[in-house]
């Protein structure tokens, strides 16, 4: 039976040509995290395997870097990154585990406009 | 006790294919990743490539990628190497290496096959 | 793909003596880098996993230490059969690599 449950930072935006760390927790279970993959849609963007460590996808490799931990940096920013991020956590013997963040990115004076409004 | 044996290497011509097999004993082979290093005469370690235990991912050296194949067969504890299209530079001695499971050390090696490209 | 550079690339030391060699990644690898003992003809022995992790069977002389970009293998007093060329691994990131290597040598 699948027990755990993955906690996710959720919806995150970020100004353009900054960047963002994209983090998942898998908690409430014992089983083995063999491997973690981060995909944007149906694209693959890097995978973190328990044996043979971090492998980035070719057409990334300039802008995402591995970490911290099991998490995801993306690095310069642009308007077409907005979209929805998804964790999948491969366990034994549970089986697979999927988060979801969902990303907005925003032109420099829009997230400056929008801090001024946050409630602290 | 654990123990591994490689096999295929040999004096072939550049351009032309070689298959390396690498025979694991003594130990739960579907349980591990394994790994080709290998070690050109007088020079130091380079990793090749390596799998993890059900085939899922697989990595490679840039100097072989495109022209080399890992693979594995669980139920033969075997581990292979297909090389193609080799080069002068691939002359080597190849060995199969076994890590430390999830530690990514390499605890356990063959004592290595011999590939000499040459015409 | 990450880079290890040891140095030095030689040393020559005497029985007894301490002998420290670094290995330093062009990118930071956390604690994924291991050392390797090799001697003619022979193949590598594994001496320290996760920069600082001994080996089972290996002497307690041997000892590995740093984290992220810089790290160091030490041998705290070298014995006859310590004479050998030794190799820093990264596994981090896919490709996984060695450094270059470092031969002790007898003074």
């Known amino acids: 039976m699948m027990t755990g449950t993955i906690e996710t930072t959720g919806n995150i935006s970020a100004e353009k040509g900054g960047s963002i760390i994209l983090q998942c927790h898998l908690s409430s279970t014992t089983a083995q995290v063999t491997q973690v993959n981060w995909e944007q849609q149906d694209q693959l963007l890097a995978i973190c395997n328990a044996d043979l460590g971090w492998h980035i996808s070719p057409s990334f490799k300039d802008r995402v870097a591995p970490g911290p931990g099991l998490g995801l940096t993306l690095q310069s920013l642009t308007v077409n990154d907005t979209g929805e991020y998804f964790c999948i956590y491969h366990t034994y013997p549970d089986g697979t585990y999927t988060g979801r963040i969902f990303l907005e990115v925003l032109e420099s004076s829009v997230a400056e406009h929008g801090a001024r409004f946050q409630i602290p | 006790q654990v123990q591994l044996v490689e096999s295929g290497g040999g004096l072939v011509q550049p351009g032309r294919s070689l298959r390396l097999s690498c025979a694991a004993s003594?130990?739960?082979?579907?349980?591990?990743?394994m790994h080709w290093v290998r070690q050109a005469p007088g020079k130091g370690l380079e990793w090749v490539s390596g799998i993890t235990w059900n085939s899922g991912l697989i990595g490679y050296a840039d100097s072989v990628k495109g022209r080399f194949t890992i693979s594995r067969d669980n139920a033969k504890n075997s581990l292979y190497l297909q090389m193609n299209s080799l080069r002068a530079e691939d002359t080597a001695l190849y060995y199969c290496?076994?890590?430390?499971?999830?530690?990514?050390?390499?605890?356990?090696w063959g004592q290595g096959t011999m590939v000499t490209v040459s015409s | 793909d990450i880079q290890l550079t040891q140095s030095p690339s030689s040393v020559s030391a005497s029985v007894g003596d301490r002998v420290t060699i670094t290995c330093r990644a062009s990118?930071?690898?956390?604690?994924?880098l291991a050392w390797y003992q090799q001697k003619p003809g022979k193949a590598p022995k594994l001496l320290i996993y996760g920069a600082s992790s001994l080996q089972s069977g290996v002497p307690s002389r041997f000892s590995g230490s740093g984290s992220g970009t810089d790290f160091t293998l030490t041998i705290s007093s070298l014995q006859p059969e310590d004479f050998a060329t030794y190799y820093c691994q990264q596994a981090f990131y896919l490709p996984w690599t060695f450094g270059g290597g470092t031969k002790v040598e007898i003074k």
């Open positions: 990118q930071g690898i956390s604690s994924w």
């Open positions: 290496a076994k890590p430390v499971p999830r530690l990514r050390g390499l605890d356990v």
């Open positions: 003594g130990f739960t082979f579907r349980d591990y990743a």
